[in-house]
């Protein structure tokens, strides 16, 4: 807290300019009018204030706007945004995507801070849903943003927004998140033809059910092993050897290198060894010839 002292003669700030870098904290407090600061916030970002000086400027704005800053000030905060606490940000009503972009730019290249997370939360809640433009903006700054949302939060993403999602945006998503996103992606891309559809849907397939994988196997899609390894184990297990062969196309040879890893390992255990042998890859661990396969899950359901 800066002590209240009178502004020395001749030091009253008539505008926000670089001469203020020479002011002490108490001089900024005494000589800079808060209303002047608010109307010339766009200049602050171009002036090399110290963090100590920024503390004073923030304090002046806090006094002027105890209920929270207006958007006209927020959009010009620049690096003063780094001084804001999540509690400060919760008082804001940010509706403009341009304001959001301006503040995200300040934090660019850094991890998502609690301030940024609060800002995004306030913005998205204010909009009611994660629309395409917002998602475009957020994933441009934070490729992992989508995967930081809970399945419940993801449920508010409209299918139209899925067009903004890039493969790298889904890199850190877990199966529960992909379970929510996949049906939206399927809906978003439903009018595309086979090969184009597969290119778009590929990143979301970690949430695909067995029947969709079976359908894809009929379309000569040549899924790569990296995508196959991200599929839900429970969706892969019911696939036949023939279906997997069609699904992977020339990439089927990669199964050998992955035979000890899920879901390939678990899938091999469910296949007849005879069928696996038809691939000519030397995959071992299938059900030996003459053994009866009981579907215990079906038996439990009947009892």
């Amino acid at each position: 807290e800066v002590e209240k002292t009178a502004c020395p003669s001749g030091k009253k700030a008539r505008e926000i300019d670089e001469s203020l870098i020479f002011y002490k904290k108490w001089e900024l407090e005494a000589c800079v009018d808060a209303a002047l600061l608010a109307t010339q916030m766009d200049r602050v970002n171009a002036i090399p204030f110290t963090y100590e000086q920024l503390d004073v400027l923030k304090h002046k704005l806090d006094e002027l706007y105890p209920q929270g800053y207006p958007e006209s000030v927020i959009q010009h905060l620049g690096y003063l945004f780094l001084k804001m606490s999540p509690e400060d940000i919760r008082k804001w009503n940010v509706t403009s995507l341009e304001t959001l972009k301006a503040l995200l730019e300040v934090n660019k290249g850094h991890e998502m801070s609690p301030q940024v997370a609060t800002l995004i939360d306030r913005f998205v809640k204010g909009r009611g849903q994660l629309d395409k433009d917002t998602l475009d903006t957020l994933t441009a700054f934070y490729p992992g943003y989508l995967c930081s949302l809970s399945p419940e939060e993801l449920s508010s993403v409209p299918p139209s927004s899925i067009w903004a999602v890039r493969p790298q945006d889904l890199d850190t998503c877990d199966p529960r998140q992909l379970d929510v996103l996949y049906p939206k992606a399927r809906l978003a891309f439903q009018n595309m033809n086979g090969s184009e559809y597969f290119v778009k849907i590929q990143s979301f397939l970690g949430g695909a059910p067995t029947e969709d994988l079976k359908a894809l196997s009929q379309q000569n899609v040549s899924m790569d092993l990296a995508t196959f390894m991200k599929l839900r184990t429970d969706a892969v297990l019911p696939l036949t050897v023939a279906e997997v062969q069609k699904l992977l196309g020339p990439h089927v040879e990669g199964l050998k290198a992955e035979e000890r890893h899920r879901p390939v390992r678990d899938w091999i255990l469910r296949q007849r060894q005879d069928d696996l042998d038809t691939l000519g890859l030397g995959l071992q661990g299938g059900i030996p010839n003459g053994y009866l396969v009981l579907d215990l899950s079906m038996q439990e359901a009947l009892s």
């Epitope: 001469s19 870098i21 020479f22 002490k24 090399p48 100590e52």
Partner: antibody
């Protein structure tokens, strides 16, 4: 280790302009952490602050000298300079350049060795 | 402009003595005060800033205190290399101003 070195004529005629340059070595004048200043000390008298400059070119002068003084910076040469116009014998002094860390309770932490300037015809 | 007045203007002391120098500001300057040491023909050297913070590399026998208008520089046990002139300087507001010095001489 940052060092400062003043240079310029040791003798200036009355009514002319005194020009001095301070060369910064061992560090960059373009650091956002420092101001750079000039201070003088007339023989047997008190130290007097002349002014400060930031690498961006923004400057701040002693009101008693403001009408006659100009401090400038040349980041490409890692130098800052002092010009004092219309000099009189009262401007005879040892002139020091110094570094001032940016902070609320700052003080000149590194000084040049000083250069004696005599104003005389 | 803030005036800085030092006292005494000079003093004589012996090695091992405790020496106290005072500096008074013409108005309150909180703790925006620095102390410098200058030996004949040499450059001023920063000893203390923010009234009581010892500059890196300065011996701990030097200490500063005070706030507002009255400040003190103390040398707890005077050493031969401490005979010099000491200046205070306020950085509360520009123009920065210096005291006119206290010369510490050998008794």
């Amino acid at each position: 280790q940052v060092q400062l070195q003043e240079s310029g004529p040791g003798l200036v005629k009355p009514s002319e302009t005194l020009s001095l340059t301070c060369t910064v070595s061992g560090g960059s004048i373009s650091s956002s952490s420092y101001f750079w200043g000039w201070i003088r000390q007339p023989p047997g008298k008190c130290l007097e602050w002349i002014g400060n400059i930031y690498y961006s070119g923004s400057s701040n002068y002693n009101p008693s000298l403001k009408s006659r003084v100009t401090i400038s910076v040349d980041t490409s040469k890692n130098q800052f300079s002092l010009k004092l116009s219309s000099v009189t014998a009262a401007d005879t002094a040892v002139y020091y350049c110094a570094r001032l860390p940016r902070g609320d309770r700052d003080a000149f932490d590194i000084w040049g060795q000083g250069t004696m300037v005599t104003v005389s015809s | 402009e803030i005036q800085m007045t030092q006292s005494p203007s000079s003093l004589s002391a012996s090695v091992g003595d405790r020496v106290t120098i005072t500096c008074r500001a013409s108005q309150g300057i909180s703790n925006y005060l620095a102390w410098y040491q200058q030996k004949p023909g040499k450059v001023p050297k920063l000893l203390i800033y923010a009234a009581s913070t010892l500059q890196s590399g300065v011996p701990s026998r030097f200490s500063g205190s005070g706030s507002g208008t009255d400040f003190t520089l103390t040398i707890s046990s005077l050493q031969p290399e401490d005979f010099a002139t000491y200046y205070c300087q306020q950085s509360y507001s520009t123009p920065f101003t210096f005291g006119c010095g206290t010369k510490v001489e050998i008794k």
